[in-house]
Interface confidence: medium
């Protein structure tokens, strides 16, 4: 059987492709955040709903996946997913003096609705999430504000109003929240006096001004001949976390990269054996990206249907029938400056009853892909496409 990592990387790609289809501009999201939120949902689902969700986070090798599985195998697979996510969260959450990386999970439940103690015990065990009762029935907007203020507190006030006015109502029974907050300093700082205004080319004809940072230093680097692109790894202090930038040679070369990209290739390109230490003249724009997605249609496009239907089986979460995912909000925020990065993501799932990145020149003055990877856990914290300042 393959690990969570392979399926999660495939899932990342599927998500990215779907988000890219519907978003002309930038794309930015947290695969770890979304996977964690889905893990918390899997804990509470049973039957076909659970199987469907499990498939996006876990794959089998060979033909085994095509045969009908026994209930015991399904349970074993489910436990393996949660165990791996638990290990991932533990690894990621290890304290560091060099950066802040905080993943937070919380459940906000309608105070009169009854959630299974087993679900609450397990969600705390695997995801360090607690349940906070709120009054959706009589004070939905007050509850919404309470949830939003918790998200703000977990993301250093970078993610505000995750749930907009009117998005939660008296029929909301559970809001499942995952936030990922990262603030790091570059291992080799860009000097502010080297930052200059330059053109960033959206395509061959259109450009926008950006503040372009510059640094000539030793980085993990390689040419990707088949893709006509370069990849550079920019480490943060203590090298635990790096931002990788995948830059096409041509201004309009990003589409070709995305067509040829695969989860296996991504793993291969970023592996220590593939990259080599080179002197690189890196020109990287100061970035500020903020994206909000309703992931429901995106997840439906990658094969998750029943979790959002009124026939969803959430019987592992509650004894009450009719519980289903109402929406799946994901907001992510990224700032890249000379000192380093600040990145956050908030994922919220609202449940209602049928009734939440001489010298080699790497000049990032045209659309590129980037991702922030945690080395020890080999997980992608954030993934994005920067195509419009």
């Amino acid at each position: 059987m393959d690990s969570l990592g392979t399926a999660a990387t495939q899932f990342l790609f599927d998500l990215f492709k779907e988000l890219n289809k519907t978003n002309d501009g930038n794309v930015f999201f947290s695969p770890v955040g979304i996977s964690t939120a889905i893990g918390m949902i899997i804990l509470g689902t049973r039957g076909a709903t659970a199987s469907e969700l499990q498939k996006v986070l876990y794959t089998e090798q060979g033909t085994e996946s095509s045969r009908i599985k026994s209930e015991e195998e399904e349970i074993e697979k489910r436990e393996e997913i949660h165990h791996q996510l638990q290990m991932l969260l533990t690894e990621i959450s290890k304290f560091s003096n060099d950066y802040d990386l905080i993943i937070s999970n919380r459940l906000f439940g309608e105070k009169t609705y009854l959630f299974l103690q087993k679900y609450i015990d397990y969600v705390e065990k695997y995801y360090h999430a607690s349940l906070e009762p709120v009054d959706f029935v009589n004070a939905a907007d007050e509850s919404r504000k309470k949830i939003n203020s918790w998200v703000e507190s977990q993301t250093n006030v970078k993610v505000k109003d995750l749930f907009p006015e009117g998005s939660l109502n008296s029929s909301t029974k559970l809001v499942l929240i995952n936030t990922v907050y990262f603030k790091g300093l570059w291992d080799r700082e860009f000097k502010k006096e080297h930052t200059k205004e330059e053109d960033f080319w959206l395509n061959k004809n259109l450009s926008k001004p950006v503040q372009m940072m510059a640094l000539c230093s030793s980085f993990n680097f390689t040419f990707l001949e088949d893709l006509q692109a370069k990849i550079v790894g920019i480490p943060y202090k203590n090298n635990d976390i790096s931002m990788f930038v995948l830059l096409p040679n041509d201004i309009d070369g990003l589409e070709k990269i995305m067509d040829k990209m695969s989860p296996e290739k991504l793993v291969e390109w970023t592996s220590p054996g593939h990259l080599e230490q080179r002197r690189v003249d890196l020109r990287l724009p100061r970035l500020q990206v903020e994206e909000t997605y309703d992931l429901e249609p995106v997840l439906e496009a990658v094969g998750i249907h029943s979790a959002f239907s009124e026939h969803a089986d959430y019987s592992g979460m509650s004894a009450r029938s009719g519980l289903h995912a109402q929406n799946f909000l994901h907001r992510s925020f990224l700032v890249v400056t000379e000192e380093g990065v600040e990145a956050t993501a908030g994922t919220g799932v609202g449940l209602k009853v049928s009734s939440a990145a001489s010298c080699e020149l790497v000049h990032c003055n045209h659309p590129f892909l980037f991702f922030i990877r945690h080395r020890e856990s080999d997980s992608i914290l954030f993934f994005g496409k920067f195509s419009s300042p």
Partner: antibody
Framework: QMQLVQSGGGVVRPGGSLRLSCAAS????????MSWVRQAPGKGLEWVSG????????GYADSVKGRFTISRDNAKNSLYLQMNSLRAEDTALYYC?????????????????????????WGQGTLVTVSS | ETTLTQSPGTLSLSPGERATLSCRAS???????LAWYQQKPGQPPRLLIY???SRATGIPDRFSGSGSGTDFTLTISRLEPEDFAVYYC????????FGQGTKVELK
């Protein structure tokens, strides 16, 4: 279909012992906390004892504390009530009931079984008569 | 421990009539964690209402619950022949207590 089938009732002398069983089917037994509730002849309902989903936490009414022991075997989808030092006032129809589970942070943190719980499915009941 | 007092003790009504059953708590029922059960002779209780006003799965909409704090009401809008039974309220917020019951009998 969901079922709770009870057994083990009968007539016993004061000071005697009895073990009640409740076999569950039609639902994932180890997802749920379970309770025993009794009803004396012609009287109302009284919560007796409760156990959480994995058996790690139990609770008892003051009237049975030290005499009764609740347990479960998730592998067998079964709930038990071991009743020792029985008294005449223990005479009642005993029901096993599935708990809808917790609602409040307080009860969750305190792990007080039986508090913050209602009962959504009940067994058919088994009569326990304590008489000399 | 909370004491629940149900009234009246007995309610004599005809099919089609409206039944109003009261449950008063000696102290505030935290979070409106009050449930109503129906029990027919020789049968176990059946959950009707939880959270003071939410109908349990499969319960007809003629049954409704209301109230908060210390005063709660179960209303059966139009009595059906199968509704004649004993009704119990339960405080499941801060204690494990049940009321003594209200019998709804055929007039």
């Amino acid at each position: 279909q969901m079922q709770l089938v009870q057994s083990g009732g009968g007539v016993v002398r004061p000071g005697g012992s009895l073990r009640l069983s409740c076999a569950a089917s039609g639902f994932t037994f180890d997802d749920y906390g379970m309770s025993w509730v009794r009803q004396a002849p012609g009287k109302g309902l009284e919560w007796v004892s409760g156990i959480n989903w994995n058996g790690g936490s139990t609770g008892y009414a003051d009237s049975v504390k030290g005499r009764f022991t609740i347990s479960r075997d998730n592998a067998k989808n079964s709930l038990y009530l071991q009743m020792n030092s029985l008294r005449a006032e223990d005479t009642a129809l005993y029901y096993c009931a599935r708990e809808s589970s917790m609602t409040t942070v307080t009860t969750y943190l305190l792990r007080e079984v039986g508090v913050g719980l209602d009962f959504d499915y009940w067994g058919q009941g088994t009569l326990v008569t304590v008489s000399s | 421990e909370t004491t629940l007092t149900q009234s009246p003790g007995t309610l004599s009504l005809s099919p089609g009539e409206r039944a109003t059953l009261s449950c008063r708590a000696s102290q505030t029922v935290s979070g409106s964690y009050l449930a109503w059960y129906q029990q027919k002779p020789g049968q176990p209780p059946r959950l009707l209402i939880y959270g003071a006003s939410s109908r349990a799965t499969g319960i007809p909409d003629r049954f409704s619950g209301s109230g908060s704090g210390t005063d709660f009401t179960l209303t059966i809008s139009r009595l059906e022949p199968e509704d004649f039974a004993v009704y119990y309220c339960q405080d499941y917020g801060s204690s494990r207590t049940f009321g003594q019951g209200t019998k709804v009998e055929l007039k």
